[in-house]
């Protein structure tokens, strides 16, 4: 089938005192090879501080994942989630407060 | 992308060392770390440190306590300064962007003498 | 910090041969192995980041492989502008560490 670029969410929940957990959701995208992964400065997090999800189907002949990790409360703007696939790339922020950030890759 | 480092060749003991890397090609508040690293003689590469887009800092815990990196934005540039330098700190300085996984781009270096 | 293990610290080929550099870790760094390679006046160059993928403008006859803390980088028809000396480094544990080089000379 032809490429179908994944619309990427990423939100914020309270994890314990200072931290929060945050998580990047890559959904409806096909091929089913992603790239996904939390970076700090623009650096890819170490593989041990990050937790991926399966990449799954998702009902509609595309495919769904996720990773998440956890941060220090007031450092936010310096993780991003970078997406890779099918050759486009973008990079996604962590929102402010309790709302979140969706939209579909176009680079 | 573009950098270059440059400062001076010969640092007295116990002075500090201070380098410039000039940018080009690239804002270094657009994205990426912007690393300074150093060459022994004998070739032993060693990271000193990055600041990164928004600012913040990351240094190696060897070299902490003497470290600092900044940068003017106005000029698209950043800077290394050791402290109290000694013949060990005598090295070829690279600055380089840390890109993902990766050091993408390195300027061509800098040789630096400790000695009196 | 972890610790790099490069073999040989030099080699000398003929034309045309197939070189393989290895790179030890000492513990798993999952991946994040890059390869540089360092001409006689200093320029370094991104050859393979993240174990197996080739940085834009690399010739193909550049590849990566490895997992675990064993990994190898080989140069699959040596050609002479391929003398230089090629280091690794891991990026998944701060802070990042590299390789003692190896210095490949021509016959």
């Known amino acids: 089938g032809s490429t179908v670029p994944p619309m990427v969410n990423v939100t914020r929940s309270e994890a314990s005192e200072g931290n929060i957990t945050v998580t990047c959701r890559a959904s409806s995208f096909y091929p089913r090879n992603i790239i996904l992964t939390w970076r700090q400065d623009g650096v890819s997090l170490s593989h041990d501080t990050q937790q991926w999800g399966d990449v799954l189907p998702d009902g509609n002949g595309t495919y769904q994942t996720w990773v998440a990790t956890r941060i220090c409360r007031g450092e936010e703007q310096r993780f991003t989630c970078y997406m890779e696939h099918s050759g486009n790339h973008s990079t996604h922020p962590v929102p402010s407060g309790n709302s979140h950030h969706h939209h579909h890759h176009h680079h | 992308v573009q950098l270059q480092e440059s400062g001076p060749g010969l640092v007295k003991p116990s002075q500090s060392l201070s380098l410039t890397c000039n940018v080009t090609?690239?804002?270094?508040?657009?994205?990426?770390?912007w690393n300074w690293i150093r060459q022994f003689p004998g070739n032993k590469l060693e990271w000193i440190g990055y600041?990164?887009?928004?600012?913040?800092?990351t240094y190696n815990p060897s070299l902490k306590s003497r470290v600092s990196i900044t940068r003017d934005t106005s000029k698209n540039q950043f800077f290394l300064q050791l402290n109290s330098v000694t013949p060990e700190d005598t090295a070829t300085y690279y600055c380089?962007?840390?890109?993902?996984?990766?050091?993408?781009?390195w300027g061509l270096g800098t040789s630096v003498t400790v000695s009196s | 910090d972890i610790q790099m293990t490069q073999t040989p610290s030099s080699l000398s080929a003929s034309l045309g041969d197939r070189v393989t550099i290895s790179c030890r870790a000492n513990q798993d760094i999952s991946h994040y192995l890059n390869w540089y390679q360092q001409k006689p006046d200093g320029a370094v160059k991104l050859l393979i980041y993240?174990?197996?993928r080739i940085h834009s403008g690399v010739p193909s006859r550049f590849s990566g492989s490895g997992s675990g803390t064993d990994y190898s980088l080989t140069i699959a028809n040596l050609e002479q502008e391929d003398v230089a000396t090629y280091f690794c480094q891991q990026g998944n544990t701060p802070p990042t560490t590299f390789g003692g080089g190896t210095k490949v000379e021509i016959k």
């Open positions: 090609g690239y804002s270094i508040t657009g994205d990426y770390a």
């Open positions: 380089a962007r840390w890109r993902n996984w990766a050091m993408d781009y």
């Open positions: 993240y174990t197996s």
């Open positions: 600041i990164g887009y928004t600012g913040s800092t």
